[in-house]
């Protein structure tokens, strides 16, 4: 058993049928010695008396808010949460496996640049009685500071019969140098509590591996005289690290017909313009990627050919 | 991903082309190592990230773009002295900081070259003959060093009398390649920045 926060405790249980559970001793936070009784949640049934209460915690029915009273007055509370270990592996009931980039990916994180700011998000089908708390650091032994905000509900989607909820959090490394070569990964730890179930999820990454630039901005077409060709131009996104000559991007320019089946023409360039043939009803799209370290491509920025 | 190969303009900063080739070569070598050594811990998540140049050179600090020198987090610089007669710079562009930066890059390349050659000698003794260093990568390191053209004492190749532990050598190869790729990215960024200046 360990303390998650004041008056909230997590009991770790080897979870299998007929398991013996864990013996837990609760102590009433009071100078009083006599006339103390204990109850669980809203029930008025007295579980025991005295300054300490010994319980055998086996199932969720044994978890909850234990209260010690004296003469109708509440003295203190202890909330017990359960953390299930199933065959040596901590349970992951609360969050959905996003399966990207690989199986057992519960937290996904992205950064728009090298400033040390990043966003993480996760999915759940649970809509109520759910709380998250996020901590982060650079490295785990002798950790360096990363400050995270509060996790917020950022999207709701309908998936088949189920509703899916997306939560996200923004974090900022306290003293980040965009040019630094990372040798210790960022660690992100999310505590999730659903009703009386506690779970924790972690992710470990280098900022360089989670970079996904914003799409190029100011995408424009300039027809070339007496030609079906157009000059496409664009700019680096505002959110990208500067100077751009140091943090350079490479670009992919795509000409796509109205039908998805039509052949796509693709050109790769390090410049911020390209000459392409604009077909009728086609659209031109441009996306960006770090020129020197192949992390994710940005989403496409698009303009119609007409 | 296949990038179009850039052909440098005659007036272009001479080292840019070499640094691009270096990054391409080390990335290909790392990919090959990860595929060949699939049963070894060779992924970024599994290896210890060690920098053999740590406390010996300070390339990131010495080559920091001017725009980032205002960022206090970038300025935990280490005092290091370098030889300062590089040929990548046209003499009118030579500045002490730039020379310091380029000589730091040269020292990095020299250290990695020694490590890779020592390692290759060990790998050639492996009865499994599982993996060797790409000669193209070693050649590209050499080309960039020649383009930088710094006078520096030659570092003797490390020789080891004891029987090599091939498992450890292959894991060390992965560690070295990951670190060298990160340094090659920095070198490419620096060359691109200097070329634009």
């Amino acid at each position: 058993i360990w303390e998650l926060k004041k008056d909230v405790y997590v009991v770790e249980l080897d979870w299998y049928p007929d398991a013996p559970g864990e013996m837990v001793v609760l102590t009433c936070d009071t100078p009083e010695e006599d006339g103390i009784t204990w109850t669980l949640d809203q029930s008025s049934e007295v579980l025991g008396s005295g300054k300490t209460l010994t319980i055998q915690v086996k199932e969720f029915g044994d978890a909850g808010q234990y209260t010690c009273h004296k003469g109708g007055e509440v003295l203190s509370h202890s909330l017990l949460l359960l953390h299930k270990k199933e065959d040596g592996i901590w349970s992951t009931d609360i969050l959905k496996d996003q399966k990207e980039p690989k199986n057992k990916t519960f937290l996904r994180c992205e950064a728009k640049n090298y400033s040390g700011r990043f966003t993480c998000w996760w999915l759940t089908t649970i809509s109520t009685d759910l709380t998250f708390s996020v901590k982060s650091s650079r490295g785990s032994s002798d950790p360096q500071g990363v400050t995270c905000g509060a996790a917020t509900l950022s999207a709701e989607r309908v998936r088949g019969d189920n509703k899916e909820y997306e939560y996200s959090v923004e974090c900022q490394e306290d003293s980040a140098c965009p040019a630094a070569e990372e040798s210790l990964p960022i660690e992100v730890m999310v505590d999730a509590v659903h009703k009386l179930k506690y779970e924790n999820y972690t992710s470990s990454f280098f900022i360089r591996d989670i970079i996904k630039p914003d799409p190029p901005k100011n995408l424009q077409l300039k027809p070339l005289k007496n030609s079906r060709q157009v000059e496409v131009s664009w700019e680096y996104p505002d959110t990208w690290s500067t100077p751009h000559s140091y943090f350079s991007l490479t670009f992919c320019v795509q000409v796509q017909g109205k039908s998805k089946r039509e052949k796509k023409d693709r050109v790769f360039t390090d410049k911020t313009s390209a000459t392409v043939i604009c077909r009728k009803n086609a659209s031109i799209s441009v996306r960006a990627q770090d020129r020197y370290y192949s992390s994710s491509w940005s989403e496409w920025a698009s303009v119609p050919c007409s | 991903r296949n990038l179009p190969v850039a052909t440098p303009d005659p007036g272009m900063f001479p080292c840019l082309h070499h640094s691009q080739n270096l990054l391409r070569a080390v990335s290909n070598m790392l990919q090959k190592a990860r595929q060949t050594l699939e049963f070894y811990p060779c992924t970024s998540e599994e290896i210890d990230h060690e920098d053999i140049t740590k406390d010996k050179t300070s390339t990131v600090e010495a080559c920091l773009p001017l725009e980032l020198t205002k960022n206090e987090s970038c300025l935990n610089s280490r005092e290091t002295s370098f030889i300062t007669n590089g040929s990548c710079l046209a003499s009118r562009k030579t500045s002490f900081m730039m020379a310091l930066c380029l000589s730091s890059i040269y020292e990095d390349l020299k250290m990695y070259q020694v490590e890779f050659k020592t390692m290759n000698a060990k790998l050639l003794m492996d009865p499994k003959r599982q993996i060797f260093l790409d000669q193209n990568m070693l050649a590209v390191i050499d080309e960039l060093m020649q383009a930088l053209n710094f006078n520096s004492e030659t570092v003797p190749q490390k020789s080891s009398l004891e029987e090599p532990d091939f498992y450890k050598t292959k894991i060390k190869l992965c560690i070295l390649l990951h670190a060298f790729r990160i340094r090659a990215v920095t070198i490419d960024r620096v060359m691109s920045y200097l070329n634009a200046s």
Partner: antibody
Amino acid sequence: QVQLVQSGGGVVQPGRSLRLSCAASGFTFSSYGMHWVRQAPGKGLEWVAFIRYDGSNKYYADSVKGRFTISRDNSKNTLYLQMKSLRAEDTAVYYCKTHGSHDNWGQGTMVTVSS
Amino acid sequence: SYVLTQPPSVSGTPGQRVTISCSGGRSNIGKNTVKWYQQLPGTAPKLLIYGNDQRPSGVPDRFSGSKSGTSASLAITGVQAEDEADYYCQSYDRGTHPALLFGTGTKVTVLG
């Protein structure tokens, strides 16, 4: 004490269907994940499928994906394996088993796929 | 489809020490715990070892398990006639959990 009693096995022709049941008692069935494991005659153990305690997630071996469906009725304390498009290579003893560091197995039920 | 490799058979005379190896990889045994089962002819498997080296109550202390890196082993010190059976190791793979990964199985024969 924990008990898992299986039923539903038998002889079936290739391409036909069969449903296996596993009745649980002696524990809070709705709190635990459950597996199906099979063993072809003279061969080793092969995992078939898993279902979470609340039925929300199901996982299958590639060899049965799209043909077998694992399900549970927590109100009846019963686990099921619906097997469709059966093949000769599905011939095996099928076991249900609880998920956890200490596990409990059903007695097994023989499924023979033969024309 | 078996990722965990065991020797097909091992044998020993009563009282001898018999060991069975179970060889896996970094993503399964390297990352997760190992169980061992004993299966007597015509019966369901019985748990002998969980959590690499833990014995459930009721299992004789002549059975012991260990794990090192990407391999595990089961030792029977002072093998007895009633130990003649098939033995299976089991673990999980990081990417496919909760799918059970079973070893190929080892037939233990007690001679004489």
